[in-house]
């Protein structure tokens, strides 16, 4: 397991919300990518492949998430204080072997700017 | 401990069908992509057919498309192969097996833990 | 699809002694997509070595897998009384497929 800090933006803010971006190399095929808050599982993706290229999803713990082709974000939204944290991408590389779990992370701090809804 | 029991085999004549059933149990089963996998006693291995964790994706040997239908039930822990239109050439022990890493695929997996397996016979 | 053949066909040692097998891919097995498998009579294979190098869980260390592209070889280092098996290669991209085997048997 290699362990380190994401050398680049993780987090990007918006509206209230935060977007965690989890990067894989372009070259994997199948993996599991899993978005720890400490250590506690928030979010969880699969992709796999069949014959023919056929792609298939699943989310274990679901949250609102987006894939491309070296990437998965996660989103959190309303913000409170609680969210701040270490966040780390847990990623489960199936295909191409060897099988290889890495894990990147990074500090989100919450700033009054950032909070969802913030009192007047 | 993880266990895969294969049942459903058995003597047919050729042309006949038979229901092959794969029970798994201490393993969180649709975490895993499943195959089959059989073996002429005495001979090497082939692999027949595979599913995904949910059976939206399925493939198998060309030996056997066409007339083995791959499927599965997560609720109940199962993994099943319908064989129709069975030949002699089909008789062999039947395997079923995971795929190794807990991934959900078939494809491009190999596997690790396999059942003792159940024997098919195609005669006259 | 990629055909596999492994040699040889059997192999005569005693125990203690290093053992090498080999399988050779009619074309190039991408991405080291190669497993070795062992079984012995009446159970079913045992995965050994995945990605042609990786050793599977609880796999001792005296097995080895090494090889790229077309040609392949599974090592035993010293050959324990319970290695004495059937050995099967297999490419698993796409459509899984085995070699006819490799027995290992006492001299």
């Known amino acids: 397991e290699i362990n380190g800090s994401a050398n680049y933006e993780m987090f990007i803010f918006h509206n209230g919300g935060v977007q965690i971006l989890c990067k894989y190399p372009d070259i994997v095929q199948q993996f599991k990518m899993q978005l720890l808050k400490g250590g506690q599982i928030l979010c969880d993706l699969t992709k796999t492949k069949g014959s023919g290229n056929t792609v298939s999803i699943k989310s274990l713990k679901f949250c609102h998430s987006q894939l491309s082709n070296n990437s998965v974000s996660f989103f959190l939204y309303n913000l409170d204080r609680s969210h701040a944290n270490y966040y780390f991408c847990n990623l489960s590389i199936f295909d191409p072997p060897p099988f290889k779990v890495t894990l990147t992370g990074g500090y989100l701090h919450i700033y009054e700017s950032q909070l969802c809804c913030q009192l007047k | 401990e993880v266990q895969l029991v294969e049942s459903g085999g058995g003597v047919v004549r050729p042309g006949g069908s038979l229901r092959l059933s794969c029970a798994a149990s201490g393993l969180t089963f649709d975490d895993y992509g499943m195959s089959w996998v059989r073996q002429v006693p005495g001979k090497g291995l082939e692999w027949v057919s595979g599913?995904?964790?949910?059976?939206?994706?399925?493939d198998y040997a060309d030996s056997v498309k066409g007339r083995f239908t791959i499927s599965r039930d997560n609720a109940k822990n199962s993994l099943y192969l319908q064989m129709n239109s069975l030949r002699a050439e089909d008789t062999a022990l039947y395997y079923c097996?995971?795929?190794?890493?807990?991934?959900?695929?078939?494809?491009?997996?190999?596997?690790?833990?396999w059942g003792q397996g159940t024997l098919v016979t195609v005669s006259s | 699809e990629i055909v596999l053949t492994q040699s040889p066909g059997t192999l005569s040692l005693s125990p203690g002694e290093r053992a090498t097998l080999s399988c050779r891919a009619s074309?190039?097995?991408?991405?080291?997509?190669l497993a070795w498998y062992q079984q012995k009579p009446g159970q079913a294979p045992r995965l050994l070595i995945y990605?042609?190098?990786s050793r599977a869980t609880g796999i001792p260390d005296r097995f080895s897998g090494s090889g790229s592209g077309t040609d392949f070889t599974l090592t035993i280092r010293r050959l324990e009384p319970e290695d004495f098996a059937v050995y099967y290669c297999?490419?698993?991209?796409?459509?899984?497929?085995f070699g006819p085997g490799t027995k290992v048997d006492i001299k």
């Open positions: 297999q490419q698993y991209g796409s459509s899984p497929f």
């Open positions: 074309q190039s097995v991408s991405s080291s997509y």
């Open positions: 097996a995971r795929d190794y890493y807990g991934s959900g695929s078939y494809y491009n997996v190999p596997f690790d833990y």
């Open positions: 990605g042609a190098s």
């Open positions: 599913i995904n964790w949910n059976g939206d994706n399925t």
